[in-house]
Interface confidence: low
Amino acid sequence: TLNSVLNSNAIKNLPPPLGGAAGHPGSAVSAAPGILYPGGNKYQTIDNYQPYPCAEDEECGTDEYCASPTRGGDAGVQICLACRKRRKRCMRHAMCCPGNYCKNGICVSSDQNHFRGEIEETITESFGNDHSTLDGYSRRTTLSSKMYHTKGQEGSVCLRSSDCASGLCCARHFWSKICKPVLKEGQVCTKHRRKGSHGLEIFQRCYCGEGLSCRIQKDHHQASNSSRLHTCQRH
């Protein structure tokens, strides 16, 4: 599992995302905040795509989820897969692209603020061997059983975005995890590319809000591709 890998701390010898880009096993670990990144390989084109090993959804980009690449495949071999768009089949929320959630096996828009009335329903769905299952919650003793009814405000400790109030997401914040605001138009966002840029984010931004996507700032002319700012922009 991810935890056992982390605990062994063979950080510099790990495959991506924990040890930097593929082919750069000595890449430094960017710890506070940020991604484990090697710098130069941060923004690679899709042409250079290589399957991205992962152990849980948080290791993948905001537009991806962690799963076995083959249906019924070896659960031990998981990679980051592109998120499912609206009306596509799903088994859990993380499979659906930002702004959507998994309901009755289909990715649907989260416009209706579904967590208010449907959290009990969705949480008890059978998601298989997944961190989002009810069993997954029962092992976390830090949360009370009332957590579904009292949504975390900005800065509250959380486990996942469903713990947070509307307009907030649950994101890593240094060595904790708290509710943070979903990004608005013009705000800097984190654009994950396919190779060498994922990883355990110690400081994690929320995703862009409804109708926005994370794209390179048009007027941001910089010498290096890797240092271009990404901001939330209208589709």
């Epitope: 982390l6 670990v29 960017s30 506070a32 900005e154 400790v157 060595w175 904790s176 943070k180």
Partner: antibody, heavy 122, light 112 residues
Framework: QVQLVESGGGVVQPGRSLRLSCAAS????????MHWVRQAPGKGLEWVAV????????YYADSVKGRFTISRDNSKNTLYLQMNSLRAEDTAVYYC???????????????WGQGTTVTVSS | DIVMTQTPLSLSVTPGQPASISCKSS???????????LYWYLQKPGQPPQLLIY???NRFSGVPDRFSGSGSGTDFTLKISRVEAEDVGVYYC?????????FGPGTKVDIK
Amino acid sequence: QVQLVESGGGVVQPGRSLRLSCAASGFTFSSYGMHWVRQAPGKGLEWVAVISYDGSDKYYADSVKGRFTISRDNSKNTLYLQMNSLRAEDTAVYYCARAGYSLYYYYGMDVWGQGTTVTVSS
Amino acid sequence: DIVMTQTPLSLSVTPGQPASISCKSSQSLLHSDGKTYLYWYLQKPGQPPQLLIYEVSNRFSGVPDRFSGSGSGTDFTLKISRVEAEDVGVYYCMQSKQLPFTFGPGTKVDIK
């Protein structure tokens, strides 16, 4: 008030083990990452290990990797450092420190214990 | 690993006079999120370290305003506008941009 109290230090022979504890009080321990930092006699500070708020993520300095294990028990508000295969160069004062943060800032290590002394000698 | 260096390694100051300590990192501490993860600590004799400055220039709560931090990239400075007797000790800079976190060797400040 916010307080960290280390214990478990002592004199130990090379190759033996020791377990340090750090008792936290005055804050919500389970919401904070925690560090161990050491200081050899007359020397500077050396970061040893860090553990995330829930114990899922752990990182170590190369000098202790494979020998030391950081862990925590949030129900007891206690941080631990299990030190195995101790060497003379592990002799130091060991401090636990809180990984402080606010919504917009990371404070580094904002609260420190008084330290506990570990002496590795034959 | 990021190597932190400090100059001078020792400093003798007259009370009421200013003091300045330099800290350099082997690579930039500017993170892609726009923040710079450089900290200053003071360790008074017989005590644990205490946080003075976080993220280059922010004074931690309770730290007197005679302490100030500045710098960017790889070069940083801690200034004490008017040194007082209670400021004696060893000053350390630390980076937390990258694991492992690393400290400078320390600058010992005493009173003339």
